[in-house]
Amino acid sequence: MAVTACQGLGFVVSLIGIAGIIAATCMDQWSTQDLYNNPVTAVFNYQGLWRSCVRESSGFTECRGYFTLLGLPAMLQAVRALMIVGIVLGAIGLLVSIFALKCIRIGSMEDSAKANMTLTSGIMFIVSGLCAIAGVSVFANMLVTNFWMSTANMYTGMGGMVQTVQTRYTFGAALFVGWVAGGLTLIGGVMMCIACRGLAPEETNYKAVSYHASGHSVAYKPGGFKASTGFGSNTKNKKIYDGGARTEDEVQSYPSKHDYV
């Protein structure tokens, strides 16, 4: 039961995390105009990974896409790549983890196969979360560097007569969404990996015990619980006899009126 809960929770947390990574990647507020210690403008600038926007006091917002690929800073391209890789890995991880969920039965899929799929999706979520955190952190670092550079030469003028105020940018909402989302995806991935261990019980060496029931004897042989290493079914590891004694996980793996496919 605890394994199923851990796996389910890991899936939900990762799902929220990946939705957040997608949202952050699409958001326009990766960097926003710094209003602190600046002349108050009737125009507010903010920038995303794909376009930059200007919101006027009039309420009019104008956004322009970055229609060049070669002209963009390498760091911005790197951040884009990291976020996209994070989304792709996360999406594949979600797909794999759906089939790996213990509460969903697909044909006669072994618990061992589900364990492997859970581990695979968990690793994918961890890498996805790390990609998002790395992408957001690289962008944040770029902002901090540019902020202090523009602060150093904030006022550039001709003989001190005419001043040009450089627009400084600070952290936008997307950065915080990205950090949180990346963290959630990472946590979800760790939970999936933990659930994987519970899904694939280690080999238990039971002593052979004889049960005498109505004149004939049936023996339980050891080795019936060996973990599978592949995605396919492993017939070698099936129990010889299905008696009345079952483990908690076994009970759940058989269809009942409470199972929904």
Epitope: N45, S52, E56, S57, G59, T164, V165, T167
Partner: antibody, heavy 118, light 113 residues
Framework: QVQLVQSGSELKKPGASVKVSCKAS????????INWVRQAPGQGLEWMGW????????TYAEEFKGRFVFSLDTSVSTAYLQISSLKAEDTAVYFC???????????WGQGTLVTVSS | DIVMTQSPDSLAVSLGERATINCKSS????????????LTWYQQKPGQPPKLLIY???TRESGVPDRFSGSGSGTDFTLTISSLQAEDVAVYYC?????????FGGGTKVEIK
């Protein structure tokens, strides 16, 4: 078409208060800000500030903070300018203007002359 | 506050001649985000409210005759009336539409010579 109609001229004594109205029509009132501009006799234009009808948020120019208050009644699409403790130097024509994109004042009221005299 | 300085204070031009009004701001009105200059030009005739002519330094408001044109960037701007007509006699104001307060220039009075 967009129209801003202001209240009529006012003659007030020093120390009194006055409330100038600016009724908007021909557009969605809450979508665009209302600016107030003062023009003293024979002088240039002075931007007083503006009010956002969507949020009720106000921005005042430094010299118009205190005695000057912008308000709204969105149910009748009207903006108000209230001036308290009137002084002789408040004698001017007060204009309301709609803030349109490009931060431009595309429509103006006809102006309200406020005369402060003892 | 941003100071808007207009020159000349008054200008007398013959009908059909070119009239040029200059406006200088104490800080750049160019917004890096959209590369637009937030400068607006208004025309005010006696006893009337101001009328919008040009916004974003060079974009003509609809209904404004094409003899009116705006140019310039950063801190230096110009309003040009290519062929002065009798109805163009008025006071012209430039306005900073970028920084609060949204200050106006002192105005330039255009008359017929």
């Amino acid at each position: 078409q967009v129209q801003l109609v202001q209240s009529g001229s006012e003659l007030k004594k020093p120390g009194a208060s006055v409330k100038v109205s600016c009724k908007a029509s021909g557009y969605t009132f809450t979508n665009y800000g209302i600016n107030w501009v003062r023009q003293a006799p024979g002088q240039g234009l002075e931007w007083m500030g503006w009010i956002n009808p969507n949020t009720g948020e106000t921005t005042y120019a430094e010299e118009f903070k205190g005695r000057f208050v912008f308000s709204l009644d969105t149910s009748v699409s009207t903006a108000y300018l209230q001036i308290s403790s009137l002084k002789a130097e408040d004698t001017a024509v007060y204009f309301c203007a709609r803030l349109y994109y490009g931060n431009r004042f595309d429509s103006w009221g006809q102006g309200t002359l406020v005369t402060v005299s003892s | 506050d941003i100071v808007m300085t207009q020159s000349p204070d008054s200008l007398a031009v013959s009908l059909g001649e070119r009239a040029t009004i200059n406006c200088k701001s104490s800080q750049s009105l160019l917004n890096s985000g959209n590369q637009r200059n937030y400068l607006t030009w208004y025309q005010q005739k006696p006893g009337q409210p101001p009328k919008l002519l040009i916004y974003w330094a060079s974009t003509r408001e609809s209904g404004v005759p094409d003899r009116f044109s705006g140019s310039g960037s950063g801190t230096d701007f110009t309003l040009t009336i290519s062929s002065l007509q009798a109805e163009d006699v008025a006071v012209y104001y430039c306005q900073n539409a970028y920084y609060y307060p949204l200050t106006f220039g002192g105005g330039t009075k255009v008359e017929i010579k």
